[in-house]
C-alpha cells in the first residue's frame, strides 16, 4: 500500500525537486565534458604564454564542474527514484548523501573564506587562460563563451595586463557593447571586478551558500518525513 495524504504530497514534491536537480546536474556535467574533450579547449594544455607554459587552472575548474555535475546527477537520481519507488533504502542513502554534501559545503565554505585570495587569483588565472585561448585560437568558441560570460556577468572587459593583440581583439569582438573599454581600457578591469567580488561582495556568495544549505536541510527533512511515512504505511 502506497503513502497517502500529506506524505503523498511530499513524495511528489521530492520527486519534482530532485528531477530538476538531476537535470541541472546533467547540464553541468554535459557542458563540463564538452569543455574537457573539445579539441579547441584541449589546446589549453599545450598553450604557452610567451616562453612560459600556461597554468592548468582551466582544467582544474573543468574537473570541479565534472565532479559537481556527477554528484548532482547521482544525488538527484537517488532522491527522484527513491521518492517515486517509495524505497526506504534509496531515501536513506539519499539522506546520507545530503548529510555528507552538507558537511562538505560547510567545510568548503570555511576553506573558501580562509583561502578567498587564492581562489580570486585562480579565477583571474582561469579568465586570463580563456581569454588567451580565445585570441590565440580564434576558432575556440567555448573559450569565447567563457570570456563573454565573465564580461557580461561582471560587467567588465579585459585586464590591466593585456597584450596589444588581445586589446584589439577584445575591443572589436569580445567586449560587451557599450563598454567603456573604448574610452579607457582599464575602467572596467575584470581582475579588479573579480577582486571586488571576493572581498566587497563576499556576502553574495555567503547568501548563495546559505540558500543551498537551507534547500539541503529542507530536502533532508522531506526525505526523513517520507521515509517515516513509508515505514508507517507498510505497518498497516
Amino acid at each position: 500500500m502506497g503513502v497517502e495524504g500529506c506524505t503523498k504530497c511530499i513524495k511528489y514534491l521530492l520527486f519534482v525537486f530532485n528531477f530538476v536537480f538531476w537535470l541541472a546536474g546533467g547540464v553541468i556535467l554535459g557542458v563540463a565534458l564538452w569543455l574537457r574533450h573539445d579539441p579547441q579547449t584541449t589546446n589549453l594544455l599545450y598553450l604557452e604564454l610567451g616562453d612560459k607554459p600556461a597554468p592548468n587552472t582551466f582544467y582544474v575548474g573543468i574537473y570541479i564542474l565534472i565532479a559537481v555535475g556527477a554528484v548532482m546527477m547521482f544525488v538527484g537520481f537517488l532522491g527522484c527514484y527513491g521518492a517515486i519507488q517509495e524505497s526506504q533504502c534509496l531515501l536513506g542513502t539519499f539522506f546520507t548523501c545530503l548529510v555528507i554534501l552538507f558537511a562538505c559545503e560547510v567545510a568548503a565554505g570555511i576553506w573558501g573564506f580562509v583561502n578567498k585570495d587564492q581562489i580570486a587569483k585562480d579565477v583571474k588565472q582561469f579568465y586570463d587562460q580563456a581569454l588567451q585561448q580565445a585570441v590565440v585560437d580564434d576558432d575556440a568558441n567555448n573559450a569565447k563563451a567563457v570570456v563573454k560570460t565573465f564580461h557580461e556577468t561582471l560587467d567588465c572587459c579585459g585586464s590591466s595586463t593585456l597584450t596589444a593583440i588581445t586589446t584589439s581583439v577584445l575591443k572589436n569582438n569580445l567586449c560587451p557593447s557599450g563598454s567603456n573599454i573604448i574610452s579607457n581600457l582599464f575602467k572596467e578591469d575584470c581582475h579588479q571586478k573579480i577582486d571586488d567580488l571576493f572581498s566587497g561582495k563576499l556576502y553574495l556568495i555567503g547568501i548563495a551558500a546559505i540558500v543551498v544549505a537551507v534547500i539541503m536541510i529542507f530536502e533532508m527533512i522531506l526525505s526523513m518525513v517520507l521515509c517515516c511515512g513509508i515505514r508507517n504505511s507498510s505497518v498497516y
Partner: antibody, heavy 119, light 112 residues
Framework: EVQLLESGGGLVQPGGSLRLSCATS????????MSWVRQAPGKGLEWVSY????????DYADSVKGRFSISRDNSKNTLYLQMNSLRAEDTAVYYC????????????WGQGTLVTVSS | QSVLTQPSSASGTPGQRVTISCTGS?????????THWYQQLPGTAPKLLIY???NRPSGVPDRFSGSKSGTSASLAISGLRSEDEADYYC???????????FGGGTKLTVLG
C-alpha cells in the same frame, strides 16, 4: 627558415584596385596572426591591417578602413590584401609581417612590394 | 606627425655608445604596452631588434639593449660599428587609437 614573399605591386591610377599576395614558408602559417605594414617613400612605417589565424578577427588602420580588405588562404600559406579606391597617399612599399602572439610584435618581415598610385 | 616621437637623426664614431629615445604617452608606452625596436638597413625590410622593452631575439648582438621608463623607451647601442648604420624604429600599441604605432624613425650615422 621563415620566408615571406610579397607580390602584386605596381603602378595603378587613383581610384583603381590592386591585390597584393604574400607567400609564406618555414613556419606554421595557419596558426599565426599575419599583418600588413607599409612605408611611404622616404617616410616611416605605418601599420595597415592584421588578420587572425582562422580569419575570425581582423582590423584596419582608419586611413584604409572601408577600402582595403585582408584575407588569407591557409591551404596555400598565402596572405592577401585587396586594395580598392586607391589614392596617391597609398603609394608605399607594402610589407607582409608575421605577428608573434608570444612576443606581441611583428617578428618576421617580407622584402616588400612597391605600390605606386599615380595618374 | 608620429604618435611615438624619435629624434630624426643620431650619430657616433666607431666604438662609441649611442642612445635613441622614443617618447610616447599614457595611451601607449605608459599604458603598459611593450615597446619593440626594429632596424632597417638601407634598401632592406625592417628586422626585429628588441622586443618586450628589453629582450633580444636570438642572433642580435648584446651590444644592443633596450629599456623603458614611464611613457618613454630607449635603445642603446654600445661599441658602435659601421654596419650599425641604419634607420631605427620604435613600436608600441595605442589603446585610444586602437592601432599599432611606430616612431618616425631615427637615422643612425656612423662617423669616420
Amino acid at each position: 627558415e621563415v620566408q615571406l614573399l610579397e607580390s602584386g605591386g605596381g603602378l595603378v591610377q587613383p581610384g583603381g584596385s590592386l591585390r597584393l599576395s604574400c607567400a609564406t614558408s618555414g613556419f606554421p602559417f595557419s596558426s599565426n596572426y599575419m599583418s600588413w605594414v607599409r612605408q611611404a617613400p622616404g617616410k616611416g612605417l605605418e601599420w595597415v591591417s592584421y588578420i587572425s589565424s582562422s580569419s575570425t578577427y581582423s582590423d584596419y588602420a582608419d586611413s584604409v578602413k572601408g577600402r582595403f580588405s585582408i584575407s588569407r588562404d591557409n591551404s596555400k600559406n598565402t596572405l592577401y590584401l585587396q586594395m580598392n579606391s586607391l589614392r596617391a597617399e597609398d603609394t608605399a612599399v607594402y610589407y607582409c609581417a608575421r605577428y608573434s602572439y608570444g612576443r606581441d610584435n611583428f617578428d618576421y618581415w617580407g622584402q616588400g612590394t612597391l605600390v605606386t598610385v599615380s595618374s | 606627425q608620429s604618435v611615438l616621437t624619435q629624434p630624426s637623426s643620431a650619430s657616433g664614431t666607431p666604438g662609441q655608445r649611442v642612445t635613441i629615445s622614443c617618447t610616447g604617452s599614457t595611451s601607449n608606452i605608459g599604458a603598459g604596452y611593450a615597446t619593440h625596436w626594429y632596424q632597417q638597413l638601407p634598401g632592406t625590410a625592417p628586422k626585429l631588434l628588441i622586443y618586450g622593452n628589453s629582450n633580444r631575439p636570438s642572433g642580435v648582438p648584446d651590444r644592443f639593449s633596450g629599456s623603458k621608463s614611464g611613457t618613454s623607451a630607449s635603445l642603446a647601442i654600445s661599441g658602435l660599428r659601421s654596419e650599425d648604420e641604419a634607420d631605427y624604429y620604435c613600436q608600441s600599441y595605442d589603446t585610444n587609437l586602437s592601432v599599432w604605432v611606430f616612431g618616425g624613425g631615427t637615422k643612425l650615422t656612423v662617423l669616420g
